[in-house]
Interface confidence: low
């Protein structure tokens, strides 16, 4: 079937348009194209003749139309007047007519739209906004565009005039933003340039900052106000409802109580003609004074005297802190703080309670430190100690005794030889001692704060002869496997060896034997029953040596898994039962008896006479060494035959 | 958002004892000052105790002093009222407060809904 | 120990009534003075610190005036939910409070 194609459809001015032919008979004999929907010769465009190849104007000729071989026209520079059908009339050679009707459409360029309104300054919540898309253009679509987003649904915007016109009602500050409009037609779309809608705004609430509306005497006030608006604000300032100052900002330096009240913040639109208020109440707090310590007792006695510490100045409502030695009180029975812990008792002071001390006054907005304040406690003397330690001295050494005692204020300090008055020195100095220089050497401390004295004496012995020494011990009844002993040599000799002995021997080379403090002292770790021997120690220098007695080591042990005997465990009937138990132990243990596990005798031995097998079972000895601690025990089975029953069976003792 | 919620309360004999406790949270529970306030059946409020941000100072009305005891676990958020020796006229609903960081700890500005506790036999 | 009487001890007026509470302080507390409203089964509620400050969120209906030993709370208009019990504190030590004021719906 014979049909026209229009390429394009729609058509845009001063474009062209191809009236395409499809399935075009043959053998034809020409064609003719008209304006219209059916052939009229009034309004033929052209005809064509085949044989002739001659093409022929018609009364709607424009001089614009060209026509193809195939029977297509071509349109070029097409107008708005060339909308419409368009009919093809074909004349086959056997002169069969045959028709077909095609169509286009005709549209404008658009032209760039530009947008028009009806108020360049509306008033937020109070006015409407109408923008117009222009100019009007017939067979248009008109669109819009908020944002380069599609307009949102919203009760506030409204599209009329063929959504030409977008109306906003109640226009509020979020409908601040980039307006578009676009026109459409089917060959062309084209969207205006952005208008920015300026809506008029506020002030709201202004806010003041910072929020903080409490401030102590001596800050800064510095208060910024801010409130929402187009234009901006226009600010100013009132104190308890006086004008101030018309800025945003408003600055108070080194405020007082005085400057406490109530603080408006007024935001003025002139566009608007609105004013917004904001009231913040502002509280200067008076500043604590800084705090200091007064003490009852500035020079107290230890062990004798309290102190009272004392944070002044008493505040109403205040919280009062201690700390000590920079750390907050500990929990002790001798400090006792008062209900309002204004006031710090120090019940029998130490020497340890010397401080410092720090009050502090607590507000929430800060803490107050005192400054530090040191306790000047007296004590002492404590027992002088006399160095060195050495009582032995040969002749024609320098004696030189030195003597401290611990005390506040220092200790003043005699020495005394045999009760007579010496000298008033912490040192004494002898040279060139004899035999005579032995005796009482006395060294006395004085406190003159507290009045108190304390003297230590120490025996001073010059001899060539170095004097027959003798073992201390730390430990004498020492445990095997958990204890240690230490031996010491005595006395302390200046220079002088210390030798020892075991049983006669010089010592073994063992690891749980130590010498130390000169050879002086002999440790031995972990002791056990072998090392209760005898010790000697010995003494020896340029001129003379000297040995001590021995000293036994007495080395608790045991008691050791106790043996029964005799061995049998087999008796006959009427035979005598005759158990006796043994158990290595120092000291002698404690033996008990049970049989089957009922107690019987606290004996070593355990005696039943002409036995039956009634006495079968099992005869348990227990052990306890009450030194030690130690208990230990064995179990033995005893079978008793009657007579004659069984060869090679015990006859008893 | 500032929050104090209460637990611990419930029925106790004469003589007993029971510890309140009191969760914090909303707000920095290390430096504010806390404290417990109480309202007896058919009686009006009555402040109980307080306590400082570092447990440093406590303080009692006379009616509970020396039965009472305030304490306070920065690390857990956490005030505790211990009540030992517990009377008949302990009976109330005692609520936990918050005394705020600024100016000074003159009033509570946050509570709790309250615990009841009951002291009868 | 300071000790703090409100007058009335209940009061019976309309919504849109003045309503004035007046709290007395036993010796000068200067302006630590506290007002809160307790209404039943909830937890007591803050109005006005330091005798004069609106707490934050405190409608300003609600203020308050005094200082010295006494005080006073002012609520301009009542409201339907202003209808509690009002007590007075002060911030000495102890942190004792008033008898408390009914407020009630004539």
């Known amino acids: 079937k014979l049909t026209i194609e229009s390429t394009p459809f729609n058509v845009a001015e001063g474009k062209e348009v191809l009236l395409l032919v499809h399935n075009l008979p043959q053998h034809l004999f020409g064609y003719s194209w008209y304006k219209g929907e059916r052939v009229d010769g009034n309004r033929q465009i052209i005809g064509y003749v085949i044989g002739t190849q001659q093409a022929t104007p018609g009364p709607a000729y424009s001089g614009r139309e060209i026509i193809y071989p195939n029977a297509s026209l071509l349109i070029q520079n097409i107008i708005q007047n060339d909308t419409g059908f368009y009919t093809l009339h074909v004349i086959k050679s056997d002169l069969v007519n045959e028709e077909a009707t095609g169509q286009f459409r005709v549209y404008p360029e658009l032209p760039k739209p530009s947008i028009s309104s009806n108020n360049s300054k509306p008033v937020e919540d109070k006015d409407a906004v109408a923008f117009t898309c222009e100019p009007e253009t017939q067979d248009a679509t008109y669109l819009w565009w908020v944002n380069n987003q599609s307009l949102p649904v919203s009760p506030r915007l409204q599209l009329s005039n063929g959504n030409r016109t977008l109306t906003l009602f109640n226009v509020t500050r979020n409908d601040t933003a980039s307006y578009k409009c676009e026109t459409q037609n089917p060959v062309s779309a084209r969207r205006s340039d952005s208008v920015i809608l300026n809506v008029l705004y506020g002030p709201d609430a202004p806010t003041i900052s910072p929020l903080n509306t409490s401030y102590r005497s001596g800050e800064n006030l510095n208060l910024s106000c801010h409130a929402a608006s187009n234009p901006p604000a226009q600010y100013s300032w009132f104190v308890n409802g006086t004008f101030q100052q018309s800025t945003q900002e408003l600055f108070i330096p080194n405020i007082t109580v005085n400057n406490s009240g109530s603080y408006t913040c007024q935001a003025h639109n002139s566009d608007t003609g609105l004013n917004r208020t904001t009231v913040t109440t502002i509280t200067v707090y008076a500043e604590p004074p800084k705090p200091f310590i007064t003490s009852n007792n500035s020079n107290p006695v230890e062990d004798e005297d309290a102190v009272a510490l004392t944070c002044e100045p008493e505040i109403q409502n205040t919280t009062y802190l201690w700390w000590v030695n920079n750390q907050s009180l500990p929990v002790s029975p001798r400090l006792q703080l008062s209900n309002d812990n204004r006031t710090l008792t120090l019940l029998s002071v130490t020497r340890n309670d010397v401080g410092p001390y720090e009050c502090g006054i607590q507000n929430e907005l800060s803490v107050d430190h005192s400054d530090p304040v040191i306790l000047n406690v007296l004590y002492g003397p404590d027992d002088p100690t006399i160095s060195p330690s050495y009582t032995y001295y040969r002749p024609g050494v320098n004696l030189s005794l030195s003597c401290h005692a611990a005390s506040n204020p220092p200790a003043q300090y005699s020495w005394l030889i045999d009760g007579n008055i010496q000298q008033h020195t912490q040192e004494l100095f002898i040279s060139n001692i004899t035999e005579k220089n032995s005796g009482l050497y006395t060294c006395q401390a004085n406190n003159s704060a507290s009045g108190h004295s304390r003297t230590t004496v120490k025996t001073i012995t010059v001899s060539a002869e170095l004097p027959k020494p003798s073992i201390s011990s730390n430990n004498s009844k020492p445990v095997e496997d958990k204890d240690a002993v230490a031996f010491t040599c005595e006395p302390e000799a200046q220079n002088t060896t210390y030798l020892w002995w075991v049983n006669g021997q010089s010592l073994p080379v063992s690891p749980r034997l130590q010498l130390s403090n000169g050879n002086r002292t002999l440790t031995l770790f972990n002791v056990t029953r072998n090392d209760a021997r005898a010790y000697v120690c010995g003494i020896q220098n340029s001129v003379s040596a000297n040995r001590s007695d021995p000293v036994t080591l007495d080395v608790l042990y045991g008691p050791d898994t106790p043996i029964i005997s005799p061995p049998d465990s087999s008796y006959l009937s009427g035979a005598n039962l005759n158990l006796s138990c043994h158990s290595a132990s120092n000291p002698s243990p404690q033996y008990s008896w049970r049989i089957n596990g009922i107690p019987q005798q606290h004996t070593q031995v355990l005696f039943i006479a002409k036995i039956t097998p009634n006495n079968n079972g099992t005869y348990a000895c227990f052990v306890s060494n009450l030194a030690t601690g130690r208990n230990n025990s064995i179990v033995k089975s005893i079978t008793v035959s009657a007579s004659g029953t069984s060869p090679g069976l015990s006859a008893g003792a | 958002e500032v929050q104090l919620l209460e637990s611990g309360g419930g029925l106790v004999q004469p003589g007993g004892s029971l510890r309140l406790s009191c969760a914090a949270s909303g707000f920095t529970f290390s430096s504010s000052y806390m404290g417990w306030v109480r309202r007896a059946p058919g009686k009006g409020l009555e402040w109980v105790s307080s306590?400082?941000?570092?447990?440093?100072?406590?303080s009692y009305a006379d009616s509970v002093k020396g039965r009472f005891t305030i304490s306070r676990d920065n690390s857990k958020n956490t005030l505790y009222l211990q009540m030992n020796s517990l009377r008949a006229e302990d009976t109330a609903v005692y609520y936990c407060?918050?005394?705020?960081?600024?100016?000074?700890?003159?009033?509570?500005?946050?509570w709790g809904q309250g615990t009841l506790v009951t002291v009868s036999s | 120990d300071i000790q703090m009487t409100q007058s009335p001890s209940s009061l019976s007026a309309s919504v849109g009534d003045r309503v004035t509470i007046t709290c007395r302080a036993s010796q000068s507390i200067s302006s630590y003075l506290n007002w809160y409203q307790e209404k039943p089964g909830k937890a007591p509620k803050l109005l006005i610190y330091?005798?004069?400050s609106l707490q934050s969120g405190v409608p300003s209906r609600f203020s308050g005036s005094g200082s010295g030993t006494d005080f006073t709370l002012t609520i301009s208009s009542l409201q339907p939910e202003d209808f509690a019990t009002y007590y007075c504190q002060q911030a000495g030590n102890p942190h004792t409070f008033g008898q408390g004021t009914k407020l009630e719906i004539k």
């Open positions: 306590i400082g941000s570092g447990s440093y100072s406590t």
């Open positions: 407060a918050r005394y705020p960081s600024v100016p000074f700890p003159l009033h509570l500005d946050y």
């Open positions: 330091a005798a004069s």
